[in-house]
């Protein structure tokens, strides 16, 4: 380190270093002054600082602090932002794959249903995606709509292929019959339970990650108070007024100042800890019916089983529906 | 201006998005994220100390600055911060957090409540006997992994894992299935899912 300088009778040293922060020297006294107007760097004797210099030091100190805070949170911010994006994309891929599996199941097993089934399956998985992203859709309604839409096609194409092209009248009756007669057994209920549980958890998981980003962004862009600016100035820059360019703040002093400046931010700590621990609990519970990957990628199988269930009971169902929807069918045949 | 906003004072870690070679499920990826987040559990309480350790502080020097004068590093004066006559540090703490911080605390409280509600111990939700009318059903309880994968001819077996690989290899894409004559047929009735999601380290 350079040797300690001799006493500065001209403020030359202070002028020089102040230029690092502020081009031009009009604010720096030529020679030490009493400094009675100073509010932060209170002098014990003559000083080479002016009120204007103090203000510049305060501004720079606050900017320094903001940047230190942003640097401190950089790695954490990157971790959450990157993972939120990765999971959102991954969930979209799972939905897309689940849709493709379901369509492939229809294509392989029930080719006569495909054009319409593809449409209903597509609508269902679009709703699933929207729900995950926070849309105000009811999962039970989504599942009901899927089965309500599928049943008329199953009835007219698989169970009763002799019927003419379905008309709105019989379709409406069949949609109603689907629920009244529980034509798919308990499969729709099973799917509702599994899908709603897994999607709810997925949705809250993504919401939590996005809130994590918001928390970091909020604390990242905090504007520090004037009081804090004064404390930082005293710590980092007031020594310059005395020509002490190379001294560093005492460690304990720095901690006191930082605790004062960050008193508000530190209040987040309790809730941040709880946030991470609660998120961990949620993640630990995300398996089986609480894991959307597991549920959605297996959905085609459950839908297949539900159609098989209908086929197994086709005879009984056709008779019942024949009576129930007779009025609609008569109008259709006319 | 003389102030350089792009200068970060902390050694920037080189944060790379690496690609993993092994199969990785979403569930393992979630657990990995939690482990990394847990290393930041004290982030906010540790901030004051962290910032002091990343800004100039007298470590090996004999003398240090206490806000008013040059003092010996281990003297009592070093701990004193010369803030009297300026403003009260206790007062500064008493002011409480800024409105934006209070808002974010409220949001955290809310999400924590939701997360806790979702994480309640879960009993068995579904009755294994799904068919009230006594017909044989797909018998698929909520904890039977065999429910995934099929029954019946032509059923597709699913490799139930997402792989985070450099290439996206889709065996099947029936997004525009109606009227799409160029559909791929699942080879050997198996669909595997692959994707090129980077693994964050």
């Amino acid at each position: 380190q350079p040797p300690p300088p001799p006493p500065d009778a001209t403020c030359h040293q202070v002028r020089s270093f102040f230029q690092r922060l502020q081009p031009g020297l009009k604010w720096v006294p030529e020679t030490p002054v009493p400094g009675s107007d100073l509010q932060v760097c209170l002098p014990k004797g003559p000083t080479c600082c002016s009120r204007k210099m103090e203000e510049k030091y305060q501004l720079t100190a606050r900017l320094n602090m903001e940047q230190l805070l942003q640097s401190a949170s950089m790695e954490l911010k990157f971790l959450i932002i990157q993972n939120a994006a990765v999971f959102q994309e991954a969930f979209e891929i799972v939905v897309r794959h689940a849709k493709n599996y379901t369509n492939a199941m229809f294509k392989n097993n029930y080719p006569s249903l495909t054009p319409q089934a593809f449409e209903f399956v597509g609508e269902f998985f679009t709703d699933v995606s929207l729900y995950i992203l926070g849309s105000d859709i009811n999962v039970d309604d989504m599942v009901n709509e899927l089965f309500d839409s599928l049943f008329p096609v199953i009835y007219t194409q698989l169970m009763n292929p002799g019927l003419p092209d379905s008309a709105l009248d019989i379709n409406e009756c069949l949609r109603g019959a689907r629920r009244d007669l529980k034509v798919f057994g308990n499969f729709p209920k099973l799917i509702m339970t599994q899908v709603s549980k897994s999607l709810q958890v997925t949705r809250i998981f993504l919401q939590a990650l996005n809130l994590g980003i918001e928390v970091i962004n909020t604390t990242d862009h905090l504007k520090f108070s004037k009081d804090c600016g004064r404390m930082l100035t005293r710590m980092w820059y007031c020594s310059y007024c005395q020509g002490l360019m190379m001294v560093k703040p005492c460690g304990g002093y720095c901690n006191v100042v930082m605790q004062g400046c960050m008193a508000g931010v530190v209040e987040i700590d309790k809730y941040w800890r709880e946030y991470i621990l609660s998120l961990e609990e949620l993640v630990n519970g995300m398996y089986r019916i609480y894991d959307m990957e597991n549920v959605l990628l297996g959905l085609f199988s459950t839908i297949h089983d539900s159609i098989q269930y209908v086929q197994k009971n086709a005879g009984k169902l056709t008779t019942t529906i024949g009576k129930l929807c007779a009025h609609s069918q008569q109008r259709q045949y006319r | 201006s003389a102030y350089y906003p792009e200068d970060l004072f902390i050694d920037k870690k080189v944060l790379k998005v690496a690609h993993v070679e092994h199969e990785e499920t979403l569930s393992s990826r979630r657990r990995e994220l939690i482990q990394k987040l847990k290393s930041f559990i004290s982030f906010y309480s540790a901030l004051p100390g962290y910032i002091c350790s990343h800004s100039p502080v007298a470590e090996n020097d004999t003398l240090c600055w206490n806000g008013q004068e040059l003092v010996e590093r281990y003297s009592q004066k070093a701990a004193r911060n010369g803030m009297k006559n300026q403003f009260n540090l206790h007062e500064l703490k008493m002011k409480g957090p800024e409105p934006v911080v209070s808002q974010i605390i409220d949001k955290l409280k809310h999400i924590n409540q939701l997360l806790r509600t979702m994480s309640m111990p879960k009993g068995r939700v579904l009755d294994k006997n799904l068919d009230e009318e006594g017909f044989e059903s797909g018998d698929c309880g909520d904890d039977e992994d065999e429910c995934i994968g099929g029954s019946g001819d032509g059923m597709i077996k699913v490799k139930n894992q997402l792989r985070f690989l450099a290439e996206l290899a889709y065996d099947l894409d029936v997004d525009d299935a109606p009227g799409n004559s160029q559909q791929a047929t699942p080879k050997d009735n198996e669909i595997s899912t692959f994707h090129n999601l980077g693994n964050v380290h």
Epitope: R20, T60 | Y4
Partner: nanobody, 118 residues
Framework: QVQLVESGGGLVQPGGSLRLSCAAS????????MSWVRQAPGKGLEWVSA????????HYADSVKGRFTISRDNSKNTLYLQMNSLRAEDTAVYYC???????????WGQGTLVTVSS
Amino acid sequence: QVQLVESGGGLVQPGGSLRLSCAASGFTFSSFAMSWVRQAPGKGLEWVSAISGSGGRTHYADSVKGRFTISRDNSKNTLYLQMNSLRAEDTAVYYCAKEALTGVFDYWGQGTLVTVSS
């Protein structure tokens, strides 16, 4: 451990040129602004020039503006000061300094002496 080692000083005639180098180690060089500071015999410290971490911004004291050029090579972790049209009053020990915060220096080199004399 942060280390700054200056080199390139020497005796030069007025109007001549010199190029000072400062080899840095022990920290992520490109993340920090760097400065040159000098101390003339029997005088106080004088800040000479600063450069941002990326090298995109430079800043000079009025006394050297137009004559000195600060630069850095982040791939080599080296800071430079090209001094042209040297004058007798530029005679000093030149230190390179790492900036922890804007205008606040936490590490200094051991210095290299530049003597401008005929």
